[in-house]
């Protein structure tokens, strides 16, 4: 089993992850594994030599580069927040703020714009990824109602009258919830005070 | 080499705020992150936010929005910690902190005292 | 937010003692854990940084490992400037959190 350096007629490595072809040596080399660069190229008698990024700066994968990225904070103008922060072998990870959807992709989200509203009697429909598209507006399922113009508002059940000793007024729909009465009409002027057996 | 230099001691009546300040020299301040850790009487340190003053963009811990607002000043390469409303369980010590990989360096700490 | 629990909150041990703290996180933070020394009355002072790796002029009887939820710090040879209380921290996602510490006193 070769160890890095070694040559190669083929033009390939063994290791493709963590080796790299050398075509003026015609050699097979040892990648700097993620975190580190090139501090000094290989040669026929010496394997590539890794250092350390520095501070502020990152590679993510093994590699063959001689310098590290700059890391690069997420940019709050195009509504990107941070989850986690930039390290010697990872860029800085981001996401759309809260009420915003990726609206450009590059790889990665580079720019993030507001969620639309859904109108009363609709909601979002629930994703699987917070932030990966705009809003689906589905109607409110029965039983259920929205009464605002909003990105985030939930339906919610409608009121039970029953359970708080009163009787319905009116009926609750997609856009307002029931509307309950007390079941005892107050008594008129001329009775109060009088019981009624 | 890397200083951070915080304000002295503070005593606050509860409901109050108080702004710390951290003067940071021996590095470029704009392009490397400063966040701001507490340390209660016998608590864990606990992790407030930061701000990148490269744009000036501060992130908060959910626990403290709205109570909490870091900021910089670019010319004078210092950062503030401000926090409002005041209660006795904010009585700690602040630190400023640079992170990379961990918090290398620290400024000493601000006492912040909250009695009435 | 992730909890970093740490073990055990006291120890006592003597000069010469090898001593080990763990840390245990609520999930996994990879390798992007640090270990700090604090004394009374200061800051708190890297020791370790990415599970294992010593931060510059760190001596090397203090080693960190582990990865993904598990994390130790070892001091093969217990110092007398090493009585101290001893902190791990996450900062693998915001909120970055901390262990709540592990002072390690004279016996």
């Known amino acids: 089993q070769a160890v890095p350096p070694y040559a190669s007629e083929n033009q390939t490595c063994r290791d493709q992850e963590k080796e790299y072809y050398e075509p003026q040596h015609r050699i097979c080399c040892s990648r700097c594994p993620p975190g580190t660069y090139v501090s000094a190229k290989c040669s026929r008698i010496r394997d590539t030599v890794c250092a350390t990024c520095a501070e502020n700066s990152y590679n993510e994968h093994w590699n063959y580069l001689t310098i590290c990225q700059l890391c690069r904070p997420c940019d709050p103008v195009m509504g990107l927040e941070e989850i986690a922060p930039c390290t010697s072998k990872r860029k800085t990870q981001c996401r759309c703020q809260p009420g915003m959807f990726c609206a450009a992709w590059a790889l990665e989200c580079t720019h993030c714009e507001l969620l639309s509203d859904c109108p009363p009697g609709t909601e979002a429909e629930l994703k699987d990824e917070v932030g990966k598209g705009n809003n689906h507006c589905v109607p409110c399922k029965a039983g259920h109602f929205q009464n605002t113009s909003s990105p985030s508002a939930r339906c919610q059940p409608h009121t039970r009258c029953e359970n708080q000793g009163l009787v319905e007024a009116a009926p609750g729909t997609a856009q307002s919830d029931t509307t309950c009465k007390n079941p005892l009409e107050p008594l008129p002027p001329e009775m109060s005070g009088t019981m009624l057996m | 080499q890397v200083q951070l230099v915080q304000s002295g001691a503070e005593v606050k009546k509860p409901g109050s705020s108080v702004k710390v300040s951290c003067k940071a020299s021996g590095y470029t301040f704009t392009t490397y992150y400063l966040h701001w850790v507490r340390q209660a009487p016998g608590q864990c340190l606990e992790w407030m936010g930061w701000?990148?003053?490269?744009?000036?963009?501060?992130q908060y811990n959910e626990k403290f929005k709205g109570r909490v607002t870091i900021t910089a000043d670019k010319s004078t390469s210092t950062a503030y910690m401000e926090l409002s409303s005041l209660r006795s369980e904010d009585t700690a010590v602040y630190y400023c902190?640079?992170?990379?990989?961990?918090?290398?360096?620290w400024g000493q700490g601000t006492t912040v005292t909250v009695s009435s | 937010d992730i909890q970093m629990t740490q073990s055990p909150s006291s120890l006592s041990a003597s000069v010469g003692d090898r001593v080990t703290i763990t840390c245990k996180a609520s999930q996994n933070v990879g390798i992007n854990v640090a270990w700090y020394q604090q004394k009374p009355g200061k800051a708190p002072k890297l020791l370790i940084s990415?599970?294992?790796y010593r931060y510059s002029g760190v001596p090397s009887r203090f080693s960190g490992s582990g990865s993904g939820t598990d994390f130790t710090l070892t001091i093969s040879s217990l110092q007398p400037e090493d009585f101290a209380t001893y902190f791990c921290?996450?900062?693998?996602?915001?909120?970055?959190?901390f262990g709540c510490g592990t002072k390690v006193e004279i016996k």
């Open positions: 921290q996450q900062y693998d996602t915001y909120p970055f959190t």
């Open positions: 701000i990148y003053p490269g744009n000036v963009h501060a």
């Open positions: 902190a640079r992170s990379w990989e961990g918090f290398p360096y």
């Open positions: 990415s599970a294992s």
